[in-house]
Interface confidence: low
């Protein structure tokens, strides 16, 4: 790959696994102020594929909590208001970065990690595979 | 506020920020192989609010390449395969860590950021405002 | 200025119970979500309790579960740990800490209180 210009500023990095050691600053630039998923939306209870919130709380890791969206059912909710099992509640999965403490409780070192989450459910229709 | 008890094997930051600036492994440990979304499953044409990916690239972030959803439809595919406009489209939004580089172009400095992205569509039953 | 004072540590005997508290002043105490940390000795820091802005939700370290019980009054400003059927593994000093900037970085502390459990 090509070598990324160096603007003049940057800083020198001497750690000897550079440039697998970067810097990063922690003072988050957030473009959104509502973090909390239950308060942002009420998607979860109107959906035809209704899914719970369930808080992932780990403190070596940041951000710390993470909510996982689990499917209430395994069908969709119909007009009537009953589940339906014809049609799949299926989840939403967003793969994100997350830092983890390494080693474990250094206060200024981390790793990248990527993990996957569920982030809502969405109503489908099921793949029906015919026996001949 | 008292200092942080460090574990015994943490590296020193000697940066004049610290604590705001902290080191970064960036090999990323990977717990999953799939990374593109439209690979990983086909629930975006399988929905009853299907949705189009659009890909966002960005040389000055981490990752570069962002997948967003954008519902096709304002309304819900029904039984028939028409568009039902008595029930809802609407994107799920996942607040994700990204790092952006900072001073630009710098290769070894970066600042964490928080963006809202669009993951994919649910159907949802919609808000009926009654008027007097 | 903030400040975060804890108190009610002590010697107690396994099996014994202690209330820790935390006066809170300097900030919008119930806007924030609080925690207990410990550190015991010659070991890292570990994260035993956290409790919503509200009351709402309590989250636990597994290793205290069902042993502790994490509680706070926003009119009075005030944290809480109750601490039941205590272990000598719970000697530590027990910290309170509000708004994180990371887990377990948090921009305020107290200065600690020691909980010792003699076996």
């Known amino acids: 790959g090509i070598t990324i210009p160096r603007n003049p500023g940057c800083p020198n990095s001497e750690d000897k696994n550079f440039p697998r050691t970067v810097m990063v600053n922690l003072n988050i630039h957030n473009r959104n102020t509502n973090t909390n998923p239950k308060r942002s939306s009420d998607y979860y209870n109107r959906s035809t594929s209704p899914w719970n919130l369930h808080r992932n709380e780990d403190p070596e890791r940041y951000p710390s909590v993470i909510w996982e969206a689990k499917c209430r059912h395994l069908g969709c909710i119909n007009a009537d208001g009953n589940v339906d099992y014809h049609m799949n509640s299926v989840p939403i999965q967003q793969e994100i970065l997350v830092l983890r403490r390494e080693p474990p409780h250094c206060p200024n070192s981390f790793r990248l990690e990527k993990i996957l989450v569920s982030v809502g459910c969405t109503c489908v229709t099921p793949i029906v595979h015919h026996v001949a | 506020g008292i200092t942080i008890p460090r574990n015994p094997g943490c590296p020193n930051s000697e940066d004049k920020n610290f604590p705001r600036t902290v080191m970064v492994n960036l090999n990323i440990h990977n717990r999953n192989t799939n990374t593109n979304p439209k690979r990983s499953s086909d629930y975006y044409n399988r929905s009853t609010s299907p949705w189009n990916l659009h890909r966002n690239e960005d040389p000055e972030r981490y990752p570069s390449v962002i997948w967003e959803a954008k519902c096709r439809h304002l309304g819900c595919i029904n039984a028939d395969g028409n568009v039902d406009y008595h029930m809802n489209s609407v994107p799920i939004q996942q607040e994700i860590l990204v790092l952006r580089r900072e001073p630009p172009h710098c290769p070894n400095s970066f600042r964490l950021e928080k963006i809202l992205v669009s993951v994919g569509c649910t159907c949802v039953t919609p808000i009926v405002h009654h008027v007097a | 200025e903030v400040q975060l004072v804890e108190s009610g540590g002590g010697l107690v005997q396994r099996g014994g119970s202690l209330r820790l508290s935390c006066a809170a002043s300097?900030?919008?105490?119930?806007?924030?979500?609080m925690y207990w940390v410990r550190q015991a000795p010659g070991k890292g820091l570990e994260w035993v309790a956290s409790i919503e802005q509200d009351g709402s939700e309590e989250y636990y370290v597994d290793s205290v579960k069902g042993r502790f019980t994490i509680s706070r009054d926003n009119a009075k400003k005030s944290l809480f740990l109750q601490m039941n059927s205590l272990r000598a593994e719970d000697t530590a000093v027990y910290y309170c800490a509000k708004g994180e900037i990371l887990p377990l970085y948090f921009d305020y502390w107290g200065q600690g209180t020691l909980v010792t459990v003699s076996s």
């Open positions: 300097g900030f919008t105490f119930s806007s924030y979500r």
